[in-house]
């Protein structure tokens, strides 16, 4: 018997504005109604939390109004977005998963998914 | 630095109750998971219950379910475990401790503990 | 449920021996093993975190590996104070069970 599996892509690019998504999926070993997604960056060996959400399944993520996640959520596959990244923000994204109801309690962890930001480059001044 | 004193053991009767607390210092408390863990006389450490660090969530070993209730009030730092029906084989002594980490979860902080025994 | 094992059940070692205690999960746990010291009358202490992290301020003569189902902590060079029970945990699900522990006593 395996352990949770979670999938995530192992690269992604963010777009010009600053917004990545991603696909954190993973395989359910009971009938959990209750799921928490949490997004993790690994940066230098430093690990800080940036969102998480608990969701009833069939049901809308919802994280903080502050948050700078928005997600959906499709059976046992959450579709993750994350907004205002500047390059400084490059780093490995994993996707937690913990199934906390009805128990028991399981617990998942992606692999990550290394996000690259590249800042725009600034508009010329225009002569005219 | 973080403290976790234990309180309420004591000597009681098989099928009395007895609520022990858990007194925490040192970190905000609101912010961890907290659990409950036992070691009876001469055998090894036996986990009993966790409540996650909103109190939503709360989970037991098959030994204890529907007679322990493990519970927290964050506006005091406290952690609880009301203990019901109690059985000669609840003797042990209890510990509280701290649920840290970010990949998964790890007791980085506990409670000297509280002796229970439970005779007649 | 998730049933731990631990081998041997006890062990005598001379003080800048090496030991070697292995934990045995029922079932795949991926990473989420705990290594614990117990002493009598003490609270217990962690070492190992997520199979193979040290846990601050522990010496580095402890280490552990594995993951899956086979788990292994290993003192380099054991020390005086170091005679204690060693517990394995999972964290991967509730109930989080411990091994049953490893006494480790002076030769």
């Known amino acids: 018997c395996k352990a949770m599996h979670v999938a995530q892509p192992a690269v992604v690019l963010a777009s010009s504005r600053g917004i990545a998504s991603f696909v954190c999926e993973y395989a359910s070993p009971g009938k959990a109604t209750e799921v928490r997604v949490t997004v993790l960056r690994q940066a230098d060996s430093q690990v800080t939390e940036v969102c998480a959400a608990t969701y009833m399944m069939g049901n809308e993520l919802t994280f903080l109004d502050d948050s700078i996640c928005t997600g959906t959520s499709s059976g046992n596959q959450v579709n993750l977005t994350i907004q205002g990244l500047r390059a400084m923000d490059t780093g490995l994204y994993i996707c937690k998963v913990e199934l906390m109801y009805p128990p028991p309690y399981y617990l998942g962890i992606g692999n990550g998914t290394q996000i690259y930001v590249i800042d725009p480059e600034p508009c010329p001044d225009s002569d005219f | 630095q973080v403290q976790l004193v234990e309180s309420g053991g004591g000597v009681v009767q098989p099928g009395r109750s007895l609520r022990l607390s858990c007194a925490a210092s040192?970190?905000?408390?609101?912010?961890?998971?907290m659990h409950w863990v036992r070691q009876a006389p001469g055998k090894g450490l036996e986990w009993v219950a966790v409540i996650w660090y909103d109190g939503r969530n709360k989970y037991y070993a098959d030994s204890v379910k529907g007679r322990f209730t493990i519970s927290r009030d964050n506006s005091k730092n406290t952690l609880y475990l009301q203990m019901n029906s109690l059985r000669a084989e609840d003797t042990a002594v209890y510990y509280c401790?701290?649920?840290?980490?970010?990949?998964?979860?790890?007791?980085?902080?506990w409670g000297q503990g509280t002796l229970v025994t439970v005779s007649s | 449920d998730i049933q731990m094992t631990q081998s041997p059940s006890s062990l005598s070692a001379s003080v800048g021996g090496r030991v070697t205690i292995t934990c045995r999960a029922s079932q795949s746990i991926s990473s989420f093993l705990n290594w614990y010291q117990h002493e009598l009358g003490k609270a217990p202490k962690l070492l190992i975190y997520g199979a193979s992290s040290l846990q601050s301020g522990v010496p580095s003569r402890f280490s552990g590996s594995g993951s899956g189902t086979d788990f292994t902590l290993t003192i380099s060079s054991l020390q005086p104070e170091d005679f204690a029970t060693y517990y394995c945990?999972?964290?991967?699900?509730?109930?989080?069970?411990f091994g049953p522990g490893t006494k480790v006593d002076i030769k």
């Open positions: 040192g970190f905000t408390f609101s912010s961890y998971g």
């Open positions: 401790a701290r649920a840290s980490g970010s990949y998964s979860y790890y007791f980085d902080y």
């Open positions: 945990q999972q964290t991967y699900s509730t109930p989080f069970t």
